[in-house]
């Protein structure tokens, strides 16, 4: 065992190549310069080393910078970056949007490990807010990033950012998140033109407050019932019979399909039955 | 693989209280927003709470005092404490995981309240 612990004659290693594939891990350990390795961390990724191997690499950095390693070496950590736990993560200071992308890509296309879920919230917390380069980063790799913060996370979401949010980022937001993103997107978009507008807010209107659902009725938007049944209900109560048919336009029909269903139920319950019997839909309240 | 099995539910009289779990495996929940919403026949699915991972919940109006979500991180399990029930609480309940890759959605369990 003794002798094991220094390097073989001939062996020391002057760069990170193939060769090392075929050191045992006491070798690696031996022949491998820990500042070699942290210089040239880019090559590690093109060469096949094995899991076991990975673990001598990760061991040596950890001694070089046992306060968390530089950025320098975090942007180029590839496949190691998968045996880092989050108590290593949490020693970083990750400041480059380029680095949390490269350690995204090694993950991607799988469930959000404890490590990435650490690395985003350091990264975030670094920056003090969900910028929209950010926020565009993490939804492209996880489009269901802003549904799984709570709603004092996405406080921190500054207006701006919302131009990065698409549809289908917010699909599985619940009722107290679009509460909090609706009046960030009206603002936001707030100097839209009103079908422009419209288009832009739909995704947030489950966030929506009945004065802001009554200004939309008078702009002509043909909100479509997809996007009416998923309205706060106690936004829809309020409403108008005039209102909801202003609202809904050609889509009014629509109504008698989903009569039985929050909100379109409540709401008729909440009309006068000469009101509902305007629309000609045999709606019964 | 990831799977989401509710239990707890059953059948109780107005007034009564049931606690309903929701144990998640194969993942960290922890890293997810943990729900419950109920569909009673007929009715669209609804919206009934939240436990946000920072610890924080929310509630639907039409439970607000009644009911309260809690989890245990470390036994990847949320629950549903449902007191004072109406018979107006009757549906199927799921437990819901918004994780930021997917969301994920349990079997369900079913609740009635019989006055």
């Known amino acids: 065992e003794v002798e094991k612990t220094a390097c073989p004659s001939g062996k020391k290693a002057r760069e990170i190549d193939e060769s090392l594939i075929f050191y045992k891990k006491w070798e690696l350990e031996a022949c491998v310069d820990a500042a070699l390795l942290a210089t040239q961390m880019d090559r590690v990724n093109a060469i096949p080393f094995t899991y076991e191997q990975l673990d001598v690499l990760k061991h040596k950095l950890d001694e070089l910078y046992p306060q968390g390693y530089p950025e320098s070496v975090i942007q180029h950590l590839g496949y190691l970056f998968l045996k880092m736990s989050p108590e290593d993560i949490r020693k970083w200071n990750v400041t480059s949007l380029e680095t949390l992308k490269a350690l995204l890509e090694v993950n991607k296309g799988h469930e959000m490990s404890p490590q990435v879920a650490t690395l985003i919230d350091r990264f975030v917390k670094g920056r003090g807010q969900l910028d929209k380069d950010t926020l565009d980063t993490l939804t492209a790799f996880y489009p269901g990033y802003l549904c799984s913060l709570s709603p004092e996370e996405l406080s921190s979401v500054p207006p701006s950012s919302i131009w990065a949010v698409r549809p289908q980022d917010l699909d599985t937001c619940d009722p107290r998140q679009l509460d909090v993103l609706y009046p960030k997107a009206r603002l936001a978009f707030q100097n839209m033109n009103g079908s422009e507008y419209f288009v832009k807010i739909q995704s947030f209107l489950g966030g929506a407050p009945t004065e802001d659902l009554k200004a939309l009725s008078q702009q002509n938007v043909s909100m479509d019932l997809a996007t009416f049944m998923k309205l706060r209900t106690d936004a829809v109560l309020p409403l108008t019979v005039a209102e909801v048919q202003k609202l809904l336009g050609p889509h009014v029909e629509g109504l008698k399909a989903e009569e039985r269903h929050r909100p379109v139920r409540d709401w008729i319950l909440r009309q006068r039955q000469d009101d509902l019997d305007t629309l000609g839909l045999g709606l019964q309240g | 693989q990831v799977h989401l099995v509710e239990s707890g539910g059953g059948s109780v009289q107005v007034g009564g209280s049931l606690r309903l779990s929701c144990a998640a495996s194969?993942?960290?929940?922890?890293?997810?927003?943990m729900s419950w919403y109920r569909q009673a026949p007929g009715t669209e699915r609804e919206f009934v709470s939240s436990s946000y991972r920072d610890g924080s919940q929310s509630y639907a109006d039409s439970v607000k005092g009644r009911f309260t979500t809690s989890r245990d991180s470390a036994k990847n399990t949320v629950f549903l404490q449902m007191n004072s029930l109406k018979p107006s609480d009757t549906a199927m309940y799921y437990c819901?995981?918004?994780?930021?890759?997917?969301?994920?959605w349990g079997q369900g369990t079913q609740v009635t309240v019989s006055s």
């Open positions: 194969g993942y960290n929940a922890s890293i997810c927003r």
């Open positions: 819901n995981a918004a994780c930021p890759w997917r969301a994920y």
